[in-house]
């Protein structure tokens, strides 16, 4: 009789589909993730099951709190799709599919500098390239730890380029670039390249 009542409740909106989510949607291989399967009904004792494609990953019982499934994303196929099932007695409902986006982290970019020196100015071209990491990659250029460019998005494996003109400076300047893709909180920086101050013939990057 209880099963019948629960199934009847499901036909109304008292027992909607569960929700499957994760705080992290973009991950890299080897990353640990937590998946949360939750239900609006906080009074029922619910059995939650997690599936990926057509394999069963685990089952947990819960009442009022979401079920938490901890996984490690080590292979491409582990991106999903995932779904969870909420079951009360013989009645069950499924969540919508959830998939992770697996992104390879960017490696430290290489910064190259080319300078055209005139009597009064230096025309500087900065090139930045990260040879590994999922595209697109956003590059930002820095001078003395201050951003001097907007984020430059590259959808192919080609260097980002930024041009600037400087009055011949009296002191040396340090340039570096940052590479970042969709992985949150994961940015890498090039080694700094120092541009010496003007004085004598000290412009190692200059085109003569």
């Amino acid at each position: 009789r209880k099963a019948v009542l629960d199934c009847e409740a499901m036909k109304t909106n008292e027992f909607p589909s569960p929700c499957l989510d994760s705080k992290t949607k973009v991950v890299m291989k080897g990353q640990n993730v937590s998946m949360f399967c939750s239900h609006k009904n906080k009074s029922l004792q619910i059995t939650y099951s997690l599936f990926r494609r057509k394999t069963h990953l685990g089952t947990q019982d819960g009442k009022g709190e979401p079920a938490i499934f901890n996984l490690s994303i080590t292979e491409a196929h582990e991106s999903g799709p995932y779904k969870c099932k909420a079951q009360v007695t013989s009645c069950s409902k499924y969540s919508r599919d959830f998939s992770f986006t697996i992104v390879d982290p960017v490696t430290s970019p290489v910064l190259n500098i080319m300078v055209i020196q005139t009597e009064t100015d230096r025309h500087i071209t900065l090139h930045c390239l990260s040879v590994n990491g999922s595209l697109p990659i956003n590059y930002t250029f820095f001078e003395n730890h201050v951003a001097i460019s907007p984020a430059i998005s590259k959808y192919d494996r080609e260097p980002a380029e930024f041009n600037l003109t400087k009055k011949n400076p009296g002191e040396e300047e340090e340039y570096r670039c940052e590479a970042k893709n969709r992985l949150p909180n994961y940015a890498t920086y090039s080694h700094p390249v120092t541009m010496p101050s003007t004085g004598g013939d000290s412009c190692p990057f200059c085109l003569k």
Partner: antibody, heavy 119, light 112 residues
């Protein structure tokens, strides 16, 4: 080459125990599911149980309690421990591999090993 | 217990015939399509033909096709070839009473 090789079959007395092995080569058991299936002489295929890539095990109702599936990742081998054997357990026992993330799409099969339960 | 009923249990057909085998499940399979079909010849291990109810496994001739959803599934051989005389099994995957699989009892396709 991807293959499965069963071993450990033979003649056993009623009430006895036997452990079958399924040695996998060419792939890792930490990615794929292994399922045991049996076939009595002249009969159809019967699902015994499954161990998935996470080490979770699932059993047919009739196999639960008497049969246990385990694996040794270092040997890349899955085992089927069979206890309290009966005459009706006489069959060819197969292990089979599922597709990635699809436990029961069994695309790689071993050659089978014959278990005979008789006094 | 879940019942997977295959019909017919045997049939006789000629080369070139169109053959249809059905599988009726007592419960819906997981995702409504967690069903596969296998071919087995005497003394040999089974061979996967169809998965996801209708998708052809690698290397399987296109004369084999599958259809159906939920509880009712069909395997069709559009033009029977001499090498197709064998026994065919369906296998369903379920999550209703635990994670569970069940084979149909088999259909033997014989030469008429």
């Amino acid at each position: 080459e991807v293959q499965l090789v069963e071993s450990g079959g033979g003649l056993v007395q009623p009430g006895g125990s036997l452990r079958l092995s399924c040695a996998a080569s060419g792939f890792s058991l930490t990615i794929y599911t292994i399922t045991w299936v049996r076939q009595a002489p002249g009969k159809g295929l019967e699902w015994i149980g499954t161990i998935n890539s996470y080490g979770n095990t699932y059993y047919s109702t009739w196999a639960k309690g008497r049969f246990t599936i385990s694996r040794d990742n270092s040997k890349n081998t899955v085992y089927l421990q069979m206890n309290s054997l009966r005459a009706e357990d006489t069959a060819v026992y197969y292990c089979a591999r599922g597709y990635v993330d699809s436990d029961w799409y069994l695309n790689i099969w071993g050659q089978g090993t014959l278990v005979t339960v008789s006094s | 217990a879940i019942q997977m009923t295959q019909s017919p249990s045997s049939l006789s057909a000629r080369v070139g015939d169109r053959v249809t085998i059905t599988c009726q499940s007592s419960e819906s399979v997981y995702d409504n399509n967690y069903l596969s079909w296998y071919q087995q010849k005497p003394g040999k291990a089974p061979k996967l033909l169809i998965y996801d109810a209708s998708r052809l496994a690698s290397g399987v001739p296109s004369r084999f096709s599958g259809s159906g959803s939920g509880t009712q599934f069909t395997l069709t051989i559009s033009s029977l070839q001499p090498e197709d005389f064998a026994t065919y099994y369906c296998l369903g995957g379920y999550d209703s009473s635990g994670w569970y699989a069940a084979f149909g009892q088999g259909t033997k396709v014989e030469i008429k």
